[in-house]
């Protein structure tokens, strides 16, 4: 706490300007009117205040707005935002995307801090859903943002917002997250033609079921190996050699190089050796010719 001391004569601030950087902490506390500060917040960023001086300015705003700052002030916080705690931010009601952008800009280039996470959470909850413009903004600042959400949170993303998602935004998503996002992407891109559809849906295919992969295999898509290896193992296993060959096109040749990695390894073990031989890759480990394959899971379901 800064002690309440009277402002020396002639030092009362009439506006927020560079002369204030020469004020001691107690002088700032005594001589800067909180209401003046609030109306001239946009000037604070242009003045090289010390961290200690910024603490005093924050303290003045906290006194003026004990229930939380109004958006007119929040939008112009600038570097003062870095002084805010998650508890401070929880009191705010941020509704403008411009305000969100202004504050994210301050933290640009850094990891997502607890303050930023709280700000985003407040903003999204206030909007009710993660709309396209918000998603555009958030992924521009934090490409991994989408994958930081839980499957439950992702379920509130409307299909229309999926258009804003770039492939790199999904790099760190796990299968549970893609399970939620894939049906939304399928819905969002449903009116596109074959090749355009594949380009858009490709990044989401880690959530695709077997039936959809079978359908894609009929469309000459030439899926690359990196995409294939991100598919759900349980979705890949039922695919036949012919279907995988059609799905991957020329990239099927790379299966040899990745035969020890999932899901390639598990898929190979499920195929007839005769069928694998048709790929012309020397793949080994398939079911020997003449063996009968029993699907025990089907048998259990019947009994």
């Amino acid at each position: 706490e800064v002690e309440k001391t009277a402002c020396p004569s002639g030092k009362k601030a009439r506006e927020i300007d560079e002369s204030l950087i020469f004020y001691k902490k107690w002088e700032l506390e005594a001589c800067v009117d909180a209401a003046l500060l609030a109306t001239q917040m946009d000037r604070v960023n242009a003045i090289p205040f010390t961290y200690e001086q910024l603490d005093v300015l924050k303290h003045k705003l906290d006194e003026l707005y004990p229930q939380g700052y109004p958006e007119s002030v929040i939008q112009h916080l600038g570097y003062l935002f870095l002084k805010m705690s998650p508890e401070d931010i929880r009191k705010w009601n941020v509704t403008s995307l411009e305000t969100l952008k202004a504050l994210l800009e301050v933290n640009k280039g850094h990891e997502m801090s607890p303050q930023v996470a709280t700000l985003i959470d407040r903003f999204v909850k206030g909007r009710g859903q993660l709309d396209k413009d918000t998603l555009d903004t958030l992924t521009a600042f934090y490409p991994g943002y989408l994958c930081s959400l839980s499957p439950e949170e992702l379920s509130s993303v409307p299909p229309s917002s999926i258009w804003a998602v770039r492939p790199q935004d999904l790099d760190t998503c796990d299968p549970r997250q893609l399970d939620v996002l894939y049906p939304k992407a399928r819905l969002a891109f449903q009116n596109m033609n074959g090749s355009e559809y594949f380009v858009k849906i490709q990044s989401f295919l880690g959530g695709a079921p077997t039936e959809d992969l079978k359908a894609l295999s009929q469309q000459n898509v030439s899926m690359d190996l990196a995409t294939f290896m991100k598919l759900r193992t349980d979705a890949v296993l039922p695919l036949t050699v012919a279907e995988v060959q059609k799905l991957l096109g020329p990239h099927v040749e790379g299966l040899k190089a990745e035969e020890r990695h999932r899901p390639v390894r598990d898929w190979i073990l499920r195929q007839r050796q005769d069928d694998l031989d048709t790929l012309g890759l020397g793949l080994q480990g398939g079911i020997p010719n003449g063996y009968l394959v029993l699907d025990l899971s089907m048998q259990e379901a019947l009994s």
Partner: antibody
Framework: QVQLQQPGTELVKPGASVKLSCKAS????????MHWVKQRPGQGLEWIGS????????YYNEKFKNKATLTVDKSSSTAYMQLSSLTSDDSAVYYC????????WGTGTTVTVSS | DIVMTQSPSSLTVSVGQKVTMSCKSS????????????LAWYQQKPGQSPKLLVY???TRESGVPDRFIGSGSGTDFTLIISSVQAEDLADYFC?????????FGGGTKLEII
């Protein structure tokens, strides 16, 4: 050791076709795909396409789709590439190369298109 | 198509020197599932066919001298010859096998004083 043998030169007239061969030895021919690559004098390398010798499936670079036709003869472990409607732009060295990494290259055939 | 850009286009060094050449791709060549980069380096000596030196960006082909060192990931790759020998006079090409059509870099011509 593993070898891919190609004839040294082919001299052909503009508008004609030529069929280049690539004879493989000392490995299982049907266990590796065969690729074809074009190299013009003093220029880089261009991938033409590939063929799966086991079932004859072919894949082409869009640029060469109407120019090259890839085939194989399993009985003689030989891959072929036919080039049609030849022009001076097709004058180049053509290589066959084995497998995903192109771990073995053919000796190369120099095709000269001239009247 | 993935564009491969090599630099420098040529370089002249003396025997025993270390040489570094670069290859950049227009998109990532990393398969994050297997952590493999689908990039190969080839050497082509004058009047000869190309020869595989390195695959998966850093795995040396058997029989290739250990002075040839491949490194890099994603979009930026490097081939180093730690101590150049007279027989290394050649063109060096990188190639991506991440997607079709396969594409090659324009090459780096290594000349030796």
């Amino acid at each position: 050791q593993v070898q891919l043998q190609q004839p040294g030169t082919e001299l052909v007239k503009p508008g004609a076709s030529v069929k280049l061969s690539c004879k493989a030895s000392d490995y299982t021919f049907t266990s590796y795909w065969m690729h074809w690559v074009k190299q013009r004098p003093g220029q880089g390398l261009e991938w033409i396409g590939s063929i799966n010798p086991s079932n004859g499936d072919t894949y082409y670079n869009e640029k060469f789709k109407n120019k090259a036709t890839l085939t194989v003869d399993k009985s003689s472990s030989t891959a072929y590439m036919q080039l049609s409607s030849l022009t001076s732009d097709d004058s180049a060295v053509y290589y066959c190369a084995r497998g995903w990494y192109f771990d073995v290259w053919g000796t190369g055939t120099t095709v000269t298109v001239s009247s | 198509d993935i564009v491969m850009t090599q630099s420098p286009s040529s370089l002249t060094v003396s025997v025993g020197q270390k040489v570094t050449m670069s290859c950049k791709s227009s998109q990532s060549l990393l398969n994050s599932s297997s952590q493999k980069n689908y990039l190969a380096w080839y050497q082509q000596k004058p009047g000869q066919s190309p020869k595989l030196l390195v695959y998966f960006a850093s795995t040396r082909e058997s029989g290739v001298p250990d002075r040839f060192i491949g490194s890099g990931s994603g979009t930026d790759f490097t081939l180093i010859i730690s101590s150049v020998q007279a027989e290394d006079l050649a063109d060096y090409f990188c190639q991506q096998h991440y997607s079709t059509p396969r594409t090659f870099g324009g090459g780096t011509k290594l000349e030796i004083i």
